[in-house]
Amino acid sequence: ESALITQQDLAPQQRAAPQQKRSSPSEGLCPPGHHISEDGRDCISCKYGQDYSTHWNDLLFCLRCTRCDSGEVELSPCTTTRNTVCQCEEGTFREEDSPEMCRKCRTGCPRGMVKVGDCTPWSDIECVHKESGTKHSGEVPAVEETVTSSPGTPASPCSLSG
């Protein structure tokens, strides 16, 4: 993965200019941060802050940068070689079943259960039964009994719309 470039690293006119830098493909592929021209002769750089490509590729266009939505924070900006990394705001989490939105974490466990895991950007609080010490089942119970514990994964580029 390339070093993170920040918006400040580039002058406004560099970011504004529609003309992109060109280089030659290697064995028909262009490096990360570029896409191939229609005639296959050139590698054209992606537009900083607008689109990107992460791998050697023969894409005819770079991929649109994701924009963090309301309820998300931007962990790192989009560069020509890496998509934006978005993460749910504190007190919310992204569920595997509905990754398109951040949901509020529960404030506490139902009666008869104790909290063993905190709210994280990728999982709700985790509750276990007092007596047995077993986690609540993954099935969706009655509303007042709802407990979730999404294993989830660490923050990753939000690529749903890009």
């Epitope: 054209i44 537009k47 005819l60 266009f61 649109r64 940068c65 924009r67 719309s161």
Partner: antibody, heavy 120, light 110 residues
Framework: EVQLVESGGGLVQPGGSLRLSCAAS????????MSWVRQAPGKGLEWVAN????????YYVDSVKGRFTISRDNAKNSLYLQMNSLRAEDTAVYYC?????????????WGKGTLVTVSS | QSALTQPPSASGSPGQSVTISCTGT?????????VSWYQQHPGKAPKLMIY???ERPSGVPDRFSGSKSGNTASLTVSGLRPEDEADYYC??????????FGGGTQLTVL
Amino acid sequence: EVQLVESGGGLVQPGGSLRLSCAASGFTFSSYWMSWVRQAPGKGLEWVANIKQDGSEKYYVDSVKGRFTISRDNAKNSLYLQMNSLRAEDTAVYYCARDFSGYGDYLDYWGKGTLVTVSS
Amino acid sequence: QSALTQPPSASGSPGQSVTISCTGTSSDIGNYNYVSWYQQHPGKAPKLMIYEVNERPSGVPDRFSGSKSGNTASLTVSGLRPEDEADYYCSSYAGNNAVIFGGGTQLTVL
């Protein structure tokens, strides 16, 4: 020099259809998202729709969803807007624009527009 | 989403500065740094003047500048010239792959 030229506008009755075209030149058309924006007479601008470079993603303003279809032909360097079930409130000058960001908020080149009038 | 709010008109004498405001909500201007400004002369196509709040495309004079505070964005034109007389529209990304525009401000150079 980047050029965008719209055509296909005209007078149409409510409920009718019209297909707008936009011919692009002076840049690699297939490398950019494209948008349609409209402007009712004497009114402000309204973003209508945009389309990804290869046509695989399309987005619309709520008021035209299900009635308008944006499409493109990269081989012809052309952008289209198929407008069905037209209403009086669709009367406007329709502009095609190069969508630099892909989100409709960074439209760096515009055509001169084509007028669509919906009236009986 | 409803349109962004701009004053219908603004004016200034040659050489002066004028600022045009654009007010949105915490869902659009307040939530994203994706505000653009367009200039439109009568009967002409709009021209991009500012993007991403305060960035100028190449070819746009540095007399044009943008800023944002909270839910309000502003366009400042300094050293007014007769050719600056035009309509100015703001736009903002509003999430969910949607963009909204302001109603436009007619700038008059006195």
